[in-house]
């Protein structure tokens, strides 16, 4: 009696169980009663990453430099090429099909986490006691200057965008 289901890494065709082609190979011809499944390796710019019965291999992804992409990991006959972004850019999606510039943290905000090829800059507000006076993708909030450790006094209070201004202590007149 012809089978209705096949083992793992097999497929049913013409009431017969044929072996699937291994990753990195495509199907040329199905098996018969007398012959095995015929498979052929994918060409250099192609891949198949599963046991399959595909008659065509998939093209490797192209990391388009015009979109700010570069190759992070070259594809093989069994794996696709992995793209990432050029320095100063990060992917717009998980599949990394295009890149955008890293965001800068505005004055009053500092960098909490520096951007990578796959994630944007994470900014945080400078809390009381800290400031950032620049727009930057790298600068963190800095603590206000401690006037008293320099034997000075605060002449102008700090904000989240400006440091305190220190000055000499007022000398008591005799």
């Amino acid at each position: 009696e012809p089978p209705t289901a096949c083992r793992e890494k097999q497929y049913l065709i013409n009431s017969q169980c044929c072996s699937l082609c291994q990753p990195g190979q495509k199907l040329v011809s199905d098996c018969t009663e007398f012959t095995e499944t015929e498979c052929l390796p994918c060409s250099e710019s192609e891949f198949l990453d599963t046991w399959n019965r595909e008659t065509r291999c998939h093209q490797h992804k192209y990391c388009d430099p015009n979109l700010g992409l570069r190759v992070q990991q070259k594809g093989t006959s069994e794996t696709d090429t992995i793209c990432t972004c050029e320095e100063g850019l990060h992917c717009t999606s998980e599949s990394c099909e295009s890149c955008v510039p890293h965001r800068s943290c505005l004055p009053g905000f500092g960098v909490k986490q520096i951007a990578t090829g796959v994630s944007d800059t994470i900014c945080e507000p400078c809390p009381v006691g800290f400031f950032s006076n620049v727009s930057s993708a790298f600068e963190k909030c800095r603590p206000w200057t401690s006037c008293e450790t320099k034997d000075l006094v605060v002449q102008q209070a700090g904000t989240n965008k400006t440091d305190v201004v220190c000055g000499p202590q007022d000398r008591q007149r005799a």
Epitope: P125, P127, V128, F130, E139, K140, R142, P143, W144, T149
Partner: antibody, heavy 116, light 111 residues
């Protein structure tokens, strides 16, 4: 990746002073703010103070102003906390921790035991 | 100094259920659209691990079952569904002003 490596456990006598170190790696030391935190009997966390490695500026919790002195050595990317006139109340785990709002990276902690 | 009061001090929750931890500040820690409250997890013999910053933002690498909410003086950490590995002590901390202060901690036990 930011890593903070602290000096090992210490057993000291009451009245003595001691210095804990915290060596930073994986980032530009001068750009980050180093905090120190005390944890007594495995529970209560207390912020001791912070130091700006860029210029050595410090800010202390008033409670620890006469107890702790914070310094840095930029050349070795190391922060130090010296604890003065130790008593049994100072027995605790001390952490260095980097951050401005929350403390995103912590050292492994240094256990200090003050016992006569 | 701002005093942070956590409740409950300990909590036992069934695997897969929700754990809710509260943190109340003695004065508002919110200003200019930001709430300067943060949460940590600490397991015995380990350093505190940051979970949530600025009330509701997940630190990178922290599972989405952790969430934070609140503003002004009242803040909440939720864990749902709770997993075995979540057994730990949880702390809140503010950065509204210096000195920074921490809550007294909430010990979470998984049943």
């Amino acid at each position: 990746e930011v890593q903070l490596q602290q000096s090992g456990p210490e057993l000291v006598k009451p009245g003595a002073s001691m210095k804990i170190s915290c060596k930073a790696s994986g980032y530009s030391f001068a750009d980050y703010t180093m905090n120190w935190v005390k944890q007594s009997h495995g529970k209560k966390l207390e912020w001791i103070g912070l130091i700006n490695p860029y210029n050595g500026g410090t800010s202390y919790n008033q409670k620890f102003k006469d107890k702790a002195t914070l310094t840095v050595d930029k050349s070795s990317s190391t922060a130090y906390m010296e604890l003065l006139s130790l008593t049994t109340e100072d027995s605790a785990v001390y952490y260095c921790a980097e951050g401005v709002n929350n403390f995103a990276d912590w050292g492994q902690g240094t256990t200090l035991t003050v016992s006569g | 100094d701002i005093v942070l009061t956590q409740s409950p001090t300990s909590l036992a929750v069934f695997l897969g259920q929700r754990a809710t931890i509260s943190c109340r500040a003695s004065k508002s820690v919110s200003t200019s659209g930001y709430s300067y409250m943060h949460w940590y997890q600490q397991k015995p013999g380990q350093s505190p691990k940051p979970l949530i910053y600025l009330a509701s933002n997940l630190e990178s690498g922290v599972p989405a079952r952790f969430s934070g909410s609140g503003s002004g003086t009242d803040f909440t950490l939720n864990i749902h569904p709770v997993e075995e590995e979540d057994a730990a002590t949880y702390y809140c901390q503010h950065s509204r002003e210096l000195p920074r202060t921490f809550g007294g901690g909430t010990k979470l036990e998984i049943k």
